[in-house]
Each structure stands twice: as structure tokens, then as C-alpha cells.
């Protein structure tokens, strides 16, 4: 018995997650960040 299709109602938007590590000098350590949609959040 076939069912009627019901959609979730949400459009899926894909975003690229980019992890990066940047060396900022020998005695300053490193910055590790997470970029979501072009905004650094961590």
C-alpha cells in the first residue's frame, strides 16, 4: 500500500567547514581556527 509523500519542509543548505592552523612566530605558538561560511568561530 503506497504512502503519500510528505516533505520535511526544510531546504538543505550546504556550508563548507574549513579547519586551519597558522604559524604566527616561534614564541607565540599557533592559532587554530574553524571557519564556517567565511566566519572564524573558533
Amino acid at each position: 500500500d503506497a504512502e503519500f509523500r510528505h516533505d520535511s519542509g526544510y531546504e538543505v543548505h550546504h556550508q563548507k567547514l574549513v579547519f586551519f592552523a597558522e604559524d604566527v612566530g616561534s614564541n607565540k605558538g599557533a592559532i587554530i581556527g574553524l571557519m564556517v561560511g567565511g566566519v572564524v568561530i573558533a
Epitope: A2, E3, F4, R5, H6, D7, S8, G9, Y10
Partner: antibody, heavy 123, light 112 residues
Amino acid sequence: QVTLKESGPGLVKPTQTLSLTCSFSGFSLSTSGMGVSWIRQPSGKGLEWLAHIYWDDDKQYNPSLKSRLTISKDTSKNQVFLTITSVDPVDTATYYCVRRASSSRYDDQFDYWGQGTPLTVSS
Amino acid sequence: DVVMTQTPLSLPVSLGDPASISCRASQSIVHSNGNTYLEWYLQKPGQSPKLLIYRVSNRFSGVPDRFSGSGSGTDFTLKISRVEAEDVGVYFCFQVTHVPLTFGGGTKLELK
């Protein structure tokens, strides 16, 4: 606001092919979760669901009529079409197009109906 | 096909009185996604049907709160707490779980 309006020939002869058009405004059939059904009602009688077309061009049909029905859409013109082949006097009815919209997760309903277009099948 | 049986066929009611319409499905209309797609419509003479209730108990936008829906599985009820003159017409239940989608035969509400 959302409106739908059906149009058709009004009178067709038995064995002919019927073409109905639903012209709508206030929404787009390219929007995720949107769809349109055709439903008919013989005068003074009950309602019968015929077919449904989804935003992504998926289709579902009433199995008892599937061999005679074709539903299609022109998203750019905001129109949905229904063709019925080999019409018979029992196909005499008012034909409605109806929007089904999904407002949130699996929460959809037939919220807007057209005024209906009457069709008579007679020789 | 899922047969939707509505009772009564005709419902004479006095203004201000409550009214109740029953709708019974020939099999469960619980969808595999967990929802029950049972809807109620009112069709006034010469008009297209208008949505009152969706998913058993949810009032559509603009529908007065005197209308309420309840039920589960195969048995459903539409209640009007106090009938008003504008409520006259034919009420249909409609299942949107199984293909083909099917309507009840209708209940004609009229004033005594």
C-alpha cells in the same frame, strides 16, 4: 496572497482527451515542500483525489485512474496541468486544483483551493 | 483503498448547541513518518472546500476556536462547541496518508 484558478473547455465529447490548467499566484512550485493536487467533485456528490505534483517534479496518481491521467507543471509560468484521456460521462464534475504547502517538518496541508472549473462530458 | 466512513449523514443542530461528527478509517492512517494526516474541511453551498483542521487536531489559520479535532489510528472526531449560522454546510474528513487519498462521504450540518 495565494490564489489558484482552474480553466478548461467546459464541454467535451466522450472518448476525447481533456486538458485542464491551474494558474496560480502567491507561491512558487520551485519552493521546497510545495505541491499541487487535482481533486474533482460530481455535482451534489463527494470529493475524489486525482493526482499530485511536487516541487521537484515527482508525481503521485490515483491508481484507479492512473492510466488515463497525466499531471505536469510549468514552474516559470506558475501553472499546473492535468490531462485525462478517453473521457466518459462519469467524468462530469467540477475540477479543483489545490495547493499543499509544507510549513515545517512534515507539517503540510491542503490550505488553498481554486474556485473550481465545471466540466460536462456529453455527446 | 482506505475507506473513510462519516457519521451522521445529516446533523440538525440548534444555534448555540454543540455538534459532533465522526470519521472512521478502514485501516490505520498513521504515516511511516509518525504523523497522522487526517484533515477536516467545510464546504458551503456554491463554494470550494475550506480547511478547518489538519493532522487530526491542528486548527488552520483563522479558524475559530469553537472547532476542535481529536482521535487517533482509525477513529476521529470533529467537534463544534457552539454552532453558529455560518457553520452550515457539508463537512468532509480526508486522509492524506495512503494513496489514493480518500475523503469521507460528508456530513451536512443544518440548523433546526
